[in-house]
Amino acid sequence: MNGSEYFVKIQSFLGGAPTEDLKALSQQNVSMDLATFMKLRTDAVLPLTVAEVQKLLGPHVEGLKAEERHRPVRDWILRQRQDDLDTLGLGLQGGIPNGYLVLDLSMQEALSGTPCLLGP
């Protein structure tokens, strides 16, 4: 069974998938569509790297541009380094500027909804 066939079979169960499953799925050439991606748990999407999301979406990665202001895409963008986002060539904006350090302060993030940044 190829990645696309596998994805069709599990598609309806993905809404509650944890990060680990999404990371594993990104290695399967599944080409997840944006409708499915947008239904994923935000907390499961946030830890994914740019490379993992690119692999997960395959040719659909271009669709991130059209959804960049909607959750969970918006929240994921805020967690990525802008340099990494730029590698996609989609013009995605709002990533962490080059040279900034991300502090994983869960309380601060829970209150503000955004990661805590320290400048260069």
Partner: antibody
Framework: EVQLQQSGPELVKPGTSVKILCKAS????????MDWVKQRHGQSLEWIGD????????IYNQKFEGKAILTVDKSSSTAYMELRSLTSEDTAVYYC????????????WGQGTTLTVSS | QIVLTQSPAIMSASPGEKVTMTCSVN?????IYWYQQKPGSSPRLLIH???NLASGVPVRFSGSGSGTSYSLTISRMEAEDAATYYC?????????FGGGTKLEIK
């Protein structure tokens, strides 16, 4: 066949609010964002904002922040746009338009709802 | 915000004639979309992703361009093509439409 059926024309007084509906049929409601577009008589099209039916996430053209409020009812595949504090500037035809998630264009449009604001 | 300038604003063409209208953008965009609107009707998608014909659109319509310059061409004008045509971009927020080109039949 995909259809977006909008509510009928409205004649309302300045300062009031109105809620326009757009009922979708013929396809999976949650695979598409619902966008709203304004067109004043003889003029071009103005994008108001859109809503994602899966998450209720909304984005608005800054010009319409506070003017328009977008909501959806997934159970009836219906999108709503409420327009507040109406003035004569809000007199226009309002369209709902379907946008597939991840795409930048509107492949199906409602027939339009004419809103007239007059005392 | 990105501004789309369509030209000409109004034009007329005879049946069978080739028609070209343009959409100029003040900043580079990835794609342009084209819509047709007839009086009293809703807009209808003609072309997506700059050059792809939407479902049911006659092959006499075509789109091209890149960066800041785009065009819509009708290879042979027909009476039913009389309408106003709008370009639209989704590359930068907020999403905007051009002012339209009104195409009349001679």
């Amino acid at each position: 066949e995909v259809q977006l059926q909008q509510s009928g024309p409205e004649l309302v007084k300045p300062g009031t609010s109105v809620k326009i509906l757009c009922k979708a049929s013929g396809d999976t409601f949650t695979a598409y964002n619902m966008d709203w577009v304004k067109q004043r008589h003889g003029q071009s099209l103005e994008w108001i904002g859109d809503i994602n039916p899966n998450t209720d996430s909304t984005i608005y053209n800054q010009k319409f922040e506070g003017k328009a409020i977008l909501t959806v009812d997934k159970s009836s595949s219906t999108a709503y746009m409420e327009l507040r504090s109406l003035t004569s500037e809000d007199t226009a035809v309002y369209y709902c338009a379907r946008r597939k998630l991840g795409r930048g264009y509107f492949d199906y449009w409602g027939q339009g709802t004419t809103l007239t604001v007059s005392s | 915000q990105i501004v789309l300038t369509q030209s000409p604003a109004i034009m007329s063409a005879s049946p069978g004639e080739k028609v070209t209208m343009t959409c100029s953008v003040n900043l580079s965009v990835r794609y342009i979309y084209w819509y047709q609107q007839k009086p009293g009707s809703s807009p209808r998608l003609l072309i997506h992703d700059t050059s792809n014909l939407a479902s049911g659109v006659p092959v006499r319509f075509s789109g091209s361009g890149s960066g800041t310059s785009y065009s819509l061409t009708i290879s042979r004008m027909e009476a039913e093509d009389a309408a106003t045509y709008y370009c639209q971009q989704w590359s930068s927020f907020p999403y905007t439409f051009g002012g339209g080109t009104k195409l009349e039949i001679k």
